[in-house]
């Protein structure tokens, strides 16, 4: 379809103008330097070759410069997240230049047309950056491009086209359709900036994935596996992206990347940490809570620069709202014997008791199955900081809560009607905190009583060896 701009990225504004003689030509990309946290303030519109607006709005050549790039839109008006992000940047980096890249005329199109327009918008940003580089003291290394959805790929184009290398690009749930599997020069990629970090919050392996699934940065962070975000509800609904309609679920999950980034700016005392892992399933098993060899990082603005030879996929769990931080724990439970287990997997819950607080009852998600005479690893997370752990209550749920399990129990009963009680034996639980990297072993309160059966509980207390540090580095990072 025809693209509504000329080679200089200018839009012929013929809307509501019946006569061709009335046509006025306007820039299709505008750069608004937000000089104040006040949304009422008009800011200054920057234009290549015109230095006056830089002076009028006190552009700080030696400070950090943020370019915020919105994505495809079904509205002629900025979406609400933009104000929150600008405000958060002003709060965190008081001397920084915050520039809103307004490409609404080219983004408020059919999605396919908006995608076709990303390249020209990237060119416009690159031209602006090339011009700014001509000024004394302006450094491309101080430039941080922040692009949401389609805007992330615009940032990629800008980084690709600019003379030199921008300091950082943050991709906030980069758009998936028409970019998944694309050549690196046609999407955001690690070579577009000195450091490219990406948050993926709406990826789907089935149906339409609004956000890109593939890793596209130096670090790619997948909160909650990168798909179903807590607090967004109706998780089984795949939002339609027909022109003019988009479900609240899609908006909530896709936009969550922005809010996670905002959270990292305004709640720097509550940083969220992500952990390197090969895939979401392994992370759910609790296998990947290591901080050795740069395997963990803060997410969002506070991310430590990591230039890996390969893409680094990282995972974390979050709360449903700000502050998003949770506390991750790896639980290793060695099952040394069990009897009469039948077909069904047990449903376990743990409650953690700490010096600061006690957790709620937390489910142990069995990703595959409970292995006998083996160490089974689980991931649990709490919304509150429990402090040092003191004891653990392990509960085996009694009555089955799913029809599937009830059916399996019924079948087991038919095949073994006199099936004696199911039981398994656990002597100790090893716990590792993701946030502190400390390890602790818990032993059963009564060394003689290590068995647990449905509807029963088992208590574990800190073993006598106490906390053990195993040369693991804490994820605490220096804030920029």
């Amino acid at each position: 379809s025809p693209v509504p701009f000329g080679p200089e990225g200018r839009l012929e504004d013929k809307l509501h103008k019946p006569k061709a003689t009335q046509t006025e030509v306007k820039p299709s990309v505008r750069f608004n330097l937000r000089t104040s946290k006040d949304p009422e303030h008009e800011g200054c519109y920057l234009s290549v070759g015109h230095s006056q607006p830089l002076e009028d709005c006190s552009f700080n050549m030696t400070a950090k410069t943020f370019f915020i790039i919105h994505g495809w839109t079904m509205s002629g008006i900025f979406e609400n997240w933009l104000h929150k992000l600008v405000s958060a940047l002003h709060t965190r980096e008081k001397d920084a230049n915050v520039v809103v890249v307004d490409w609404l005329p080219l983004a408020h199109q059919l999605y396919t047309d908006a995608v076709n327009n990303t390249r020209v918008v990237g060119h416009s940003i690159a031209r602006m950056l090339d011009w700014l580089q001509e000024k004394d003291d302006f450094s491309l290394g101080n430039v941080h491009l922040i692009g949401y959805s389609l805007g992330a790929h615009v940032a990629g184009y800008a980084g690709n086209f600019v003379k030199g290398t921008v300091g950082r690009i943050t991709g906030l749930d980069p758009a998936g359709p028409m970019f998944e599997g694309a050549d690196i020069h046609k999407r955001l990629s690690p070579d577009d900036a000195d450091f490219v970090d990406v948050l993926h919050t709406y990826t789907r392996s089935f149906g339409l994935s609004i956000g890109i699934q593939m890793p596209v940065g130096h670090i790619d962070i997948y909160p909650n596996g990168g798909d179903f975000q807590p607090g967004c509800g109706l998780n089984d609904v795949l939002g339609s992206i027909a022109y003019g309609t988009i479900t609240e679920v899609v908006k909530c999950e896709h936009e969550r990347a922005v809010h996670l980034f905002v959270d990292s700016l305004v709640n720097q005392d509550k940083p969220s940490f992500a952990f390197q892992c090969t895939d979401s399933n392994r992370f759910k098993k609790g296998i990947c809570l290591s901080c050795r060899k740069n395997r963990c990082n803060s997410i969002g603005y506070n991310a430590k620069k990591m230039r890996n030879k390969r893409n680094s996929k990282m995972y974390l769990k979050t709360r449903a709202g700000m502050p998003f931080r949770v506390y991750h724990y790896q639980m290793k439970i060695h099952v040394f014997s069990y009897k009469n287990m039948g077909e069904i997997e047990p449903t376990f819950y743990v409650t953690l008791y700490g010096t600061n607080a006690d957790s709620q009852t937390l489910p142990l998600e069995i990703v595959e199955r409970i292995e006998q005479n083996a160490t089974n690893t689980f991931l649990v997370y709490t919304e509150e900081d429990l402090g040092d752990l003191l004891k653990i209550q392990l509960t085996w749920e009694g009555a089955s809560q799913s029809w599937y399990n009830l059916w399996k129990e019924f079948r087991s009963y038919l095949s073994q009607p006199r099936n004696p009680g199911r039981e398994l034996n656990i002597r100790r639980i090893r716990v590792k905190s993701g946030e502190t990297q400390r390890k602790l072993t818990f032993c059963t309160e009564d060394p003689e009583n290590t068995s647990i059966s449905p509807g029963r509980e088992l208590w574990f207390r800190k073993c006598r060896d106490g906390w053990r540090m195993k040369n693991e580095t804490s994820p605490t990072v220096e804030l920029p």
Epitope: L15, E42, N80, L82, E248, K251
Partner: antibody, heavy 119, light 107 residues
Framework: QVQLVQSGAEVKKPGASVKVSCKAS????????MHWVRQAPGQRLEWMGG????????TYNEKFKDRVTITRDTSASTAYMELSSLRSEDTAVYYC????????????WGQGTTVTVSS | EIVMTQSLATLSVSPGERATLSCRAS??????LHWYQQKPGQAPRLLIK???QSISGIPARFSGSGSGTEFTLTISSLQSEDFAVYYC?????????FGQGTKLEIK
């Protein structure tokens, strides 16, 4: 100073259309969104939609989407709101309101235009 | 759509006293909440934007607080000209919606 001046009161028959104008002055018309809000007698304020005057992009409240059209004439710094297929429940005061840079809050309002729909 | 609820339809307060008006959103709207004052026959007037940001020209006795779903407009010492109807409005998601209003009357 910023001023939004609206057209005068209108009396319309059910099924007809009404077009209300809002002339802006005291600021750069294309730099801020313009919104339309109505208030039926004794009712809460109701957002109808908004326009980005820079290029004409609009956003509407689904409730009015099939009946409302918001346009602008940048040369005259004027926004328009046309509501079609009028019914008696459309009797209200219609306001234009200037949005902030992000279009979220409305610091300046027109004086209001009373539209009466009666057979 | 997000439903804005102003639980008190009418609030009676004496001049010089403090008035506290509340507004609740049906879902989290962060700080995207604005307060307006409307007098009979007049257009609304913006008092507070983005939950707590003051507006130039608005007396300092008007202040706003809250985040998420619960918001408050406080008038520290009521003046005679403050008796009017007060509306809250969210701009977190379209359609933007207003509360039904709280009428502040002289006790």
């Amino acid at each position: 100073q910023v001023q939004l001046v609206q057209s005068g009161a209108e009396v319309k028959k059910p099924g007809a259309s009404v077009k209300v104008s809002c002339k802006a002055s005291g600021y750069t018309f294309t730099d801020y969104t313009m919104h339309w809000v109505r208030q039926a007698p004794g009712q809460r304020l109701e957002w109808m939609g908004g326009i980005n005057p820079y290029y004409g992009g609009t956003t509407y409240n689904e409730k009015f989407k099939d009946r409302v059209t918001i346009t602008r004439d940048t040369s005259a710094s004027t926004a328009y709101m046309e509501l079609s297929s009028l019914r008696s429940e459309d009797t209200a005061v219609y306001y234009c309101a200037k949005g902030d840079y992000y279009g979220g809050s409305y610091n300046y309002w027109g004086q209001g235009t009373t539209v009466t729909v009666s057979s | 759509e997000i439903v804005m609820t102003q639980s008190l339809a009418t609030l009676s307060v004496s001049p010089g006293e403090r008035a506290t008006l509340s507004c609740r959103a049906s879902q989290d709207i962060s700080n995207s909440l604005h307060w307006y004052q409307q007098k009979p026959g007049q257009a609304p007037r913006l008092l507070i934007k983005y939950a707590s940001q003051s507006i130039s020209g608005i007396p300092a006795r008007f202040s706003g607080s809250g985040s998420g779903t619960e918001f408050t407009l406080t008038i520290s010492s009521l003046q005679s000209e403050d008796f009017a109807v007060y509306y809250c409005q969210q701009s977190n998601s379209w359609p933007y919606t207003f509360g039904q209003g709280t009428k502040l009357e002289i006790k």
